[in-house]
Interface confidence: low
């Protein structure tokens, strides 16, 4: 068959599977006169043979792992054995079959992992090799965990990268591994060739012993510190420790206090630096941070809680310079006159703020001293000896000592003797009729005026009238304000009226005095009045459950992710349709029925966070009334902005020729968020070809110095490419260009002959 299995002498390549016994010839070369025979040379390995007539074949199975390519040469000879054609290269490519099993480099691996390590971060690699061709499935290895011992609640704490053999913690492992419970684990790992996909794959296993080490980066127990300490400061109160030596510790005050009285040293010991005052602040919460030598946080911050313990450093204080009470003449012994309530700034419900009351003086002492008692702990004043007479003594003044366990304070009480309360308030009418109001009547509206009168002594507690709604308004929608001069009552709306829950309310008022009635006198029907409130329906707009809805997501969430939801109800029970208003960036969509909010485009914290939109709830049907609420989407940062130059650096120049190597300083920035630390950029030259002329050296996390390595520069502009890496997750890199001109200078400035004025650098170095 001319062409496929036979033909003239020319360079050719053949592919033959290894491991197969010969079953057919490779090729039949045809001789062109004067050629009569053929000769084979090269890497024949005594396997490849050519018969004189040009029949190329092999005589036994090939082995790719011994030789993957046989480079042969075929020449055509004339009758005298002289080469007349060729030699031409003949390449035999040996195709792989899966005839080698993978083998682990070690039969046993050992490693350790710290509890709470980041999931997915490799802490150990297992490695296997397979002699088969890695470009084919035969040599493509697939790693798997066969078993984890112990296995708790059927949860895998470890995972392996099927391709690389990297062993790391799962999320559950990161959260649950605890050396106190289980200090060691054993994994049996298998490796299969054929990418693990074939029943005919070969495999090997290895054993991995893993020690779990304690994570000592833990928040300490809450600390109690006594206020106003007189001990020398600073005083060590607690400590944190990073897992390895060399960490740099700092404290972060999230509350941004004007005075932050704590510090930390480089051992991780935390100190209070000055006396604390519980009455100024009774507890502190701040954070301890551990950073590496470059200022990068090593882990999450730890929360430190300090509770300030009270001492008795505050005396009792009186409620006012003089406290005034009223007592009716002829009141009975033991009646309550009023309660003196003093205060103490020390901690509530402790001995430091527990107060005692004692009357130390009564003036006048008429008709005798000791007319009043005060309850030692409650501060309630009572009539002690006899009824009082206004015409004898219309006013008494008491001096009362109020004490805690260490301090005493004097408070002053004035007691006015008033006429007896033997008259009840009488309503001018007992029924104020019907009143019809729409349910959307404004809160604060006065809807009714009521009036009762009392014949007791004017402007005393015996004649003052307090109006109460005792029936018909369990929701507290109405209230009554009293004019103290006229005792007129103004009925006002305190909460929205609601047709749906209370269409008709039968309201009953009671008029009372703050002073008790004398013995034998009782309130009767004259002190009660009623009216009927009829509420009419108004189609009301839907009501949101909150004025502002907030949600927080990472700025890199996938399109279509649910980022929040809002809820509203219609008072009339109609269905609600939700929509968005003010989505200027086109980032969001809302499910009209459920109120769930989804992202529909990539979010970007750097464009502004929080992102504020309005959500609208509209009745379906009815009069389509709508309400508006706010939705605030707080975007959490991911590292998605490469570093760049902080400003425009055009116009940098050196005076030519350089008398000595020179340098200039530049600054980098990026738009991502940098919590607990500033940016921490690393700098390098953007290409290897620059290294003969320039070097770049880091000054700090944001600044670097570009220096010349020699003085032999041409008089022209050089564009120096700088690579800036932000070390983030993922690390992002920016390549920036610094244009530097070497020019002749006059008085320290670049000199250009007339006509060459464009782009003159303006900054000399």
């Amino acid at each position: 068959q001319e062409g496929k299995f036979s033909g003239p002498l020319k360079p050719m390549t053949f592919s033959i599977y290894e491991g197969q016994e010969p079953s057919q010839i490779i090729f039949q070369f045809k001789a062109n006169p004067p050629a009569v025979t053929f000769e084979l040379t090269g890497e024949t390995d005594n396997i490849f043979v050519i018969e004189r007539e040009g029949l190329l074949y092999y005589n036994r199975a090939l082995d790719r792992e011994t030789r993957s390519t046989h480079n042969l040469q075929v020449a055509a000879l004339d009758a005298n054995g002289i080469i007349v054609e060729g030699p031409v290269p003949i390449t035999i490519k040996v195709k792989d079959i899966n005839d080698n099993r993978p083998t682990f480099l070690q039969s046993k691996y050992e490693g350790s992992v710290r509890q709470n390590s980041r999931p997915g971060k490799p802490f150990l690699y297992v490695n296997a090799t397979d002699l088969d061709d890695p470009a084919t499935p035969n040599g493509q290895l697939y790693y798997q965990i066969v078993i984890q011992l112990p296995m708790i609640n059927n949860v895998m704490y470890f995972q392996i990268n099927n391709k690389t053999g990297a062993i790391s913690l799962t999320r559950e492992g990161s959260q649950e591994l605890n050396p106190a419970k289980n200090p060691s684990y054993n994994l049996v790992i298998s490796v299969k060739d054929m990418g693990g996909q074939s029943e005919n794959s070969f495999s090997d296993t290895t054993s991995v012993d893993i020690i779990v080490t304690e994570n000592i980066w833990k928040a300490p127990k809450p600390v109690e510190m006594v206020e106003n300490s007189t001990d020398p400061h600073p005083i060590k109160i607690t400590q944190v420790r990073w897992n390895d030596p060399g960490a740099q510790y700092s404290l972060v005050d999230k509350e941004k206090l004007p005075r932050f009285p704590f510090s930390i040293d480089q051992e991780g010991d935390i100190y209070v630096t000055q006396p604390l005052d519980r009455e100024e602040k009774d507890a502190y919460v701040f954070y301890a941070v551990a950073k590496d030598e470059y200022g990068k946080p090593l882990s999450y911050p730890l929360e430190i809680h300090v509770k300030v313990k009270d001492i008795n450093d505050n005396p009792p204080t009186c409620p006012s310079p003089v406290t005034v009470f009223e007592v009716q003449e002829n009141e009975r012994l033991g009646n309550s006159i009023g309660t003196l309530t003093a205060h103490d700034r020390d901690e509530e419900n402790t001995a430091n703020s527990f107060l005692n009351y004692r009357i130390v003086e009564q003036t006048p002492k008429l008709p005798m001293d000791g007319l009043f008692l005060i309850q030692t702990y409650a501060g309630m004043l009572q009539l002690a000896k006899q009824s009082l007479k206004k015409q004898d003594t219309p006013q008494y003044n008491l001096t009362i000592e109020v004490s805690d366990k260490d301090f005493k304070t004097l408070c002053f009480v004035q007691i006015n003797v008033i006429d007896i309360n033997d008259q009840i308030p009488i309503f001018e009418k007992s029924d104020y009729g019907n009143l019809t109001l729409a349910e959307d009547t404004n809160i604060g509206s006065t809807i009714l005026t009521i009036q009762a009168t009392d014949a007791d002594e004017p402007f005393t507690g015996s004649s003052k009238i307090l109006y109460h709604i005792i029936k018909g308004d369990s929701e507290g929608r109405l209230g009554v304000d009293t004019d103290p001069h006229t005792n007129t009552g103004y009925v006002i709306i305190k909460k929205p009226l609601d047709f749906e829950t209370a269409a008709v309310s039968n309201i009953v008022f009671k008029a009372e005095n703050p002073e008790p009635l004398v013995f034998g006198v009782k309130y009767n029907a004259s002190s009660f009045a009623k009216f009927t409130l009829i509420v009419t329906d108004v189609n009301e707009a839907p009501q949101f459950s909150q004025h502002v809805f907030q949600a927080k997501v990472s700025e890199d969430v996938a399109i279509g992710t649910k980022v929040g939801n809002v809820t509203a109800k219609d008072p009339e029970g109609l269905d609600i349709s939700y929509s968005l208003r003010g989505d200027t960036r086109g980032w969001l969509k809302i499910d009209h029925v459920t109120g769930e909010i989804f992202s529909v485009a990539p979010l970007d914290r750097e464009a502004g966070s929080p992102y504020r939109v309005q959500v609208v709830a509209t009745e379906v049907g009815g009069s389509s009334l709508s309400s508006v609420s706010e939705f605030h989407l707080i975007l959490m940062d991911v590292n998605d902005n490469p570093p760049r130059l902080a400003k425009d650096y055009t116009g940098l120049f050196f005076c030519h020729p350089l008398s000595a190597p020179g340098s200039l300083i530049f600054e980098a920035t990026d738009d991502d968020q940098h919590l607990f630390r500033g940016p921490h950029f690393t700098f390098s030259l953007g290409s290897g070809s620059l290294q003969n002329d320039w070097e770049v050296s880091k000054i700090n996390g944001t600044h670097a110095r570009l220096s010349t390595r020699h003085t032999e520069f041409e008089e022209r502009e050089y564009v120096v490419l700088i690579r800036i890496n932000d070390g983030g997750r993922p690390p992002l890199e920016g390549i920036v260009s610094l244009p530097v001109t070497f020019c002749s200078c006059v008085e320290g400035s670049c000199f250009r002959p007339a006509g060459h004025q464009t782009g003159i650098p303006t900054v000399g170095m």
Partner: nanobody, 124 residues
Framework: EVQLLESGGGLVQPGGSLRLSCAVS????????MGWFRQAPGKEREFVAR????????RYADSVKGRFTISRDNAKNTVYLQMNSLRPEDTAVYYC?????????????????WGQGTQVTVSS
């Protein structure tokens, strides 16, 4: 389980362009960081480009920077590699890969799902 299917390879002259596509099935593409790798004959598989779940972060090998662009359309469950100014040394089998680690835009070299590959040949 997630499966990846590459397409768009072929023969192109130096300086020409190709656009590779990687269709993701079995799961939503937006759950995965995605990458393109390539393997030239007789060489190890090498990283070409990768893109985060949202498409917000892209990374490239130095050898393709400025010529290749990786992008994704999560609505279509597809990742693309636009290859311009192709050179003979770009000849390789191009593989699409998925990184299912739970980190959003964090990349380890943890690509754990691979496609079968598509051949790209740059030759005059």
């Amino acid at each position: 389980e997630v499966q990846l299917l590459e397409s768009g390879g072929g023969l192109v002259q130096p300086g020409g362009s190709l656009r590779l596509s990687c269709a993701v099935s079995g799961r939503t593409a937006s759950e995965y960081g995605m990458g393109w790798f390539r393997q030239a004959p007789g060489k190890e598989r090498e990283f070409v480009a990768r893109i985060s779940t949202s498409g917000g972060v892209t990374r490239y090998a130095d050898s393709v920077k400025g010529r290749f662009t990786i992008s994704r359309d999560n609505a279509k469950n597809t990742v693309y590699l636009q290859m311009n100014s192709l050179r003979p040394e770009d000849t390789a089998v191009y593989y699409c890969a998925a990184d299912g680690l739970p980190y959003g835009d964090w990349f380890g070299d943890q690509f754990d799902v691979w496609g079968q590959g598509t051949q790209v040949t740059v030759s005059s």
